[in-house]
C-alpha cells in the first residue's frame, strides 16, 4: 500500500510520531447556573461548567473536574471562551469624583493556567471592558481565543470579575473549550 | 524508511486512519450585499455569502449552497464568524417607561446547525449585545468561534437579528468559516 | 504492526504526504510597549511584538522579524489577534454638527498580509468599533480570528488605528498568533 507519510517533504525534517486527529484531547464546556463559592481574595472567581449534556463534551482523556479542564498530554492547544455578561448600570459615567470622571464599572474574563508544581496561576488570556451604559439593562459578550504550549497535568479555568453578571441562560452564550493542535 | 507512526506513544492508544491535513474540509466565506428574502417569523434571517471570490474559498468537499455550509464528513469542527453591524440609535437609553429604563436595542449573531432528520435547528453559538449609543452613528463587530462535533450532512448558517444593520462593505469585516480539526 | 493509515477511508481520496502536527509552523506573540515609528500616510501603524519571553513563542520555521510574522510554508493557517484599547473620551456623542450627530471616534484592528512581489498589502481581517463613551476612562478589546490560505514567503502584521491607545501592560490582553492547520 502506498503510504503517504513516506514521501520526502520539501524541507529536511524529523517527524514526530504521527497520530490520528480524531484521538486528540478536546473539550467544549457550556455554562451552568453558578453556585456561590469561596474564592481567594485577590483572584476572580472561577466558573464551573457543563461537560456532557447538550453541546458540551470532553474526549480523548481531556477531563473536566471541579472547575478545571485537565490537560492529559503536552502540546500546543487552542483555548477559547466566551462569557456573556448582563447587568444594569445607573448612569455611572456621569458621576464625577473631585471634578474628574469616575473609573467606570467593568467586566473581565481571564483564562488561567494552574500548574501543580508552581504556586502562582498564569493568566493566559484576558478580555476586559469598561461598562458605562446610561440607565439601561445591558448585555454583551467577551470572546477570547489563542494558542498555548501546555504540559501534561496543567489545569485550565475561566475566571470572571463578577459571577452574578454572567448570563447562564443558554449554552450558546457562555462557553469554554480547548483542543490539541 | 523510518516511519514515525510506528513509535510507541507514551500512552496506549488505538489509532484511527491517518489522513493528510491538506485534504480536510474547510471553508472561509465573506460577506455580500444581502437581498431581502423570506424567513420564518420566529427565526432570525440567515445571511448569504461569497464562497469563491477574493479571500473566500471552500475546499475538500465542503460546499456552500443557499446560505448553508454543508458538512461532508463527520468529525470535530472549529466554526467561527464575525458580523460587523452599523446603525444609528437615537438616545434610546434615556427613554424611560413607567419609571424604569427601557429594554435597549440589541444586535445578535447566531451560528445555527440544521440536521435534515431533525426539524428544529440547533443554536451552536450566540453573540448578543445591547446597543444604546447616545445620538450617534455606531458600528461594532460580534465575533464567535468554538468547536463542535458535527455529522455528515449537517448544515451550518449564520443568522442575525437585523440584516439591514450588517456591514457588507468589506470582506474582512463580516465572515463565516469552518474547518475539520 | 497495524498501521492505521492503511485503512480505507469512507470516501475515495489521494493522500498528500502525512506529517506530525508537532512540527507545523506556529507562533503566539504578545504585546510590548510600542516605540513611535514611521508609517505610510494612508496606512495604520503596525504593532511590534514579543516573540520569545513569557507566553510568546515561534516554532518550526515560523519566524518573527520587524513587526512581521513570516510564513515558512504554503497552506491554510488560522490567524488571530486581540488588541485591548484604552482611552479617555469626552462626551463625543453629544456634540452635534449642523443638527446631526457627529461621526464618532473609533478603534480599529487590521490583520494584514504582505507579499514581497506586490507592494500593496491585503487586509485579511478587520475589527472596527465606534467609541462614544460619555466622559469616562474606557477600555475594551477587539478580537479577530479566521482561516486563510497563505503562500510561503507571505508576511503578516497587525495594524491599529492609534498606537497610543493600545494597552501594552499585560501579555494576556493584546496578542497575535497563527498556526498551520
Amino acid at each position: 500500500a502506498l503510504k503517504g507519510q513516506e514521501f520526502a517533504p520539501s524541507h529536511q525534517q524529523v517527524y514526530a510520531p504521527l497520530r490520528a486527529d480524531g484521538d486528540k484531547p478536546r473539550a467544549h464546556l457550556t455554562v451552568v447556573r453558578q453556585t456561590p463559592t469561596q474564592h481567594f481574595k485577590n483572584q476572580f472567581p472561577a466558573l464551573h461548567w457543563e461537560h456532557e449534556l447538550g453541546l458540551a463534551f470532553t474526549k480523548n482523556r481531556m477531563n473536566y473536574t471541579n472547575k478545571f479542564l485537565l490537560i492529559p498530554e503536552s502540546g500546543d492547544y487552542f483555548i477559547y471562551s466566551q462569557v456573556t455578561f448582563r447587568g444594569m448600570t445607573s448612569e455611572c459615567s456621569e458621576i464625577r469624583q473631585a471634578g474628574r470622571p469616575n473609573k467606570p464599572d467593568s467586566i473581565t474574563v481571564v483564562i488561567t493556567k494552574v500548574t501543580d508544581s508552581y504556586p502562582e496561576p498564569t493568566q493566559l488570556l484576558m478580555g476586559t471592558k469598561s461598562v458605562c451604559e446610561v440607565g439601561s439593562n445591558w448585555f454583551q459578550p467577551i470572546y477570547l481565543g489563542a494558542m498555548f504550549s501546555l504540559q501534561e497535568g496543567d489545569k485550565l479555568m475561566v475566571n470572571v470579575s463578577d459571577i452574578s453578571l454572567v448570563d447562564y441562560t443558554k449554552e450558546d452564550k457562555t462557553f469554554f473549550g480547548a483542543f490539541l493542535l | 524508511a523510518l516511519k514515525g507512526q510506528e513509535f510507541a506513544p507514551s500512552h496506549q492508544q488505538v489509532y484511527a486512519p491517518l489522513r493528510a491535513d491538506g485534504d480536510k474540509p474547510r471553508a472561509h466565506l465573506t460577506v455580500v450585499r444581502q437581498t431581502p428574502t423570506q424567513h420564518f417569523k420566529n427565526q432570525f434571517p440567515a445571511l448569504h455569502w461569497e464562497h469563491e471570490l477574493g479571500l473566500a474559498f471552500t475546499k475538500n468537499r465542503m460546499n456552500y449552497t443557499n446560505k448553508f455550509l454543508l458538512i461532508p464528513e463527520s468529525g470535530d469542527y472549529f466554526i467561527y464568524s464575525q458580523v460587523t453591524f452599523r446603525g444609528m440609535t437615537s438616545e434610546c437609553s434615556e427613554i424611560r417607561q413607567a419609571g424604569r429604563p427601557n429594554k435597549p436595542d440589541s444586535i445578535t449573531v447566531v451560528i445555527t446547525k440544521v440536521t435534515d432528520s431533525y426539524p428544529e435547528p440547533t443554536q451552536l453559538l450566540m453573540g448578543t449585545k445591547s446597543v444604546c449609543e447616545v445620538g450617534s452613528n455606531w458600528f461594532q463587530p460580534i465575533y464567535l468561534g468554538a468547536m463542535f462535533s458535527l455529522q455528515e450532512g449537517d448544515k451550518l448558517m449564520v443568522n442575525v437579528s437585523d440584516i439591514s444593520l450588517v456591514d457588507y462593505t468589506k470582506e474582512d469585516k463580516t465572515f463565516f468559516g469552518a474547518f475539520l480539526l | 504492526a497495524l498501521k492505521g493509515q492503511e485503512f480505507a477511508p469512507s470516501h475515495q481520496q489521494v493522500y498528500a504526504p502525512l506529517r506530525a502536527d508537532g512540527d507545523k509552523p506556529r507562533a503566539h506573540l504578545t504585546v510590548v510597549r510600542q516605540t513611535p515609528t514611521q508609517h505610510f500616510k494612508n496606512q495604520f501603524p503596525a504593532l511590534h511584538w514579543e516573540h520569545e519571553l513569557g507566553l510568546a513563542f515561534t516554532k518550526n520555521r515560523m519566524n518573527y522579524t520587524n513587526k512581521f510574522l513570516l510564513i515558512p510554508e504554503s497552506g491554510d493557517y488560522f490567524i488571530y489577534s486581540q488588541v485591548t484599547f484604552r482611552g479617555m473620551t469626552s462626551e463625543c456623542s453629544e456634540i452635534r454638527q449642523a443638527g446631526r450627530p457627529n461621526k464618532p471616534d473609533s478603534i480599529t484592528v487590521v490583520i494584514t498580509k504582505v507579499t514581497d512581489s506586490y507592494p500593496e498589502p491585503t487586509q485579511l481581517l478587520m475589527g472596527t468599533k465606534s467609541v462614544c463613551e460619555v466622559g469616562s476612562n474606557w477600555f475594551q478589546p477587539i478580537y479577530l480570528g479566521a482561516m486563510f490560505s497563505l503562500q510561503e514567503g507571505d508576511k503578516l502584521m497587525v495594524n491599529v488605528s492609534d498606537i497610543s491607545l493600545v494597552d501594552y501592560t499585560k501579555e494576556d490582553k493584546t496578542f497575535f498568533g497563527a498556526f498551520l492547520l
Epitope: - | T30, R33, T35, L55, Y168, K170, E171 | Y118, E120, S149
Partner: antibody
Framework: QVQLVQSGAEVKKPGASVKVSCKAS????????ISWVRQAPGQGLEWMGW????????HYARMHQGRVTMTTDTSTRTAYMELRSLRSDDTAVYYC?????????????????WGQGTTVTVSS | EIVLTQSPATLSLSPGERATLSCRAS??????LAWYQQKPGQAPRLLIY???NRATGIPARFSGSGSGTDFTLTISSLEPEDFAVYYC?????????FGQGTKVEIK
Amino acid sequence: QVQLVQSGAEVKKPGASVKVSCKASGYDFTYYGISWVRQAPGQGLEWMGWISTYNGKTHYARMHQGRVTMTTDTSTRTAYMELRSLRSDDTAVYYCARENYYGSGAYRGGMDAWGQGTTVTVSS
Amino acid sequence: EIVLTQSPATLSLSPGERATLSCRASQSVSSYLAWYQQKPGQAPRLLIYDASNRATGIPARFSGSGSGTDFTLTISSLEPEDFAVYYCQQRSNWPWTFGQGTKVEIK
C-alpha cells in the same frame, strides 16, 4: 503596475493540444482569479472559464467542459489554459484577464487587466 | 446560462454626440454587470463594473446605469478615440457571459 504577459503564437494541427501561459506581475497573484476569454476572427468575446489562484477552483463554460483545463503555479505567478482535441473553429486569439474583486460584498468587479493575447491557429 | 442581448448592433454617430448602448439580460443579474471597450488589434478594456462604477482611469463621459435585466452604457459626448466595439458581461451567475457587442462607428 499590473501586467499579464502571455506566451507566443501557436500553430497546431487538428486533434492536437495547446497550452497557453499567462505570467502575472505587479499585484498579489493569489487574491485575484484569472479568466480566459477567446475571440475568433471577426467575432465577439467568448468567456471560456475562470480559475481561483487562491485554491485552484475552476468554472468552465459548458461548451468547453471536458476539453479545457485551467491551472496555476503560484510559485511562478503563472496561469495556464490547455485546450485539447483542437478543431479549426478553435482558431482565435486567447486572452487571460485578471478578475478584479474589490474586497467588498457590494461589488463583483470586472476583468480589469488583460494579457496581450495569444493567437492560436488550428490548421491541417 | 444567462443570455445578454445588446442593441443596437451598430451605432453610427458623430464626435460630440451622445451614445446610448443597451444590454438586456435573459434573467436578473442584479447589478453585477460590466462594460468593456475593444479597439481593433487590442485587448478589451474595462470601463464600468457593477453596472454604474467607473473603472480606474476611465473618463467621466462614460457612465453606466440599470439593474436587474436592463442596463445602459452612456457616452455623453463622443471623442474620436471612443469609436470601438463595446461589450457587456454579466457576473451574477456562472458561466460568465458576454453580449454580442455594439459597434460605435463614425457617421
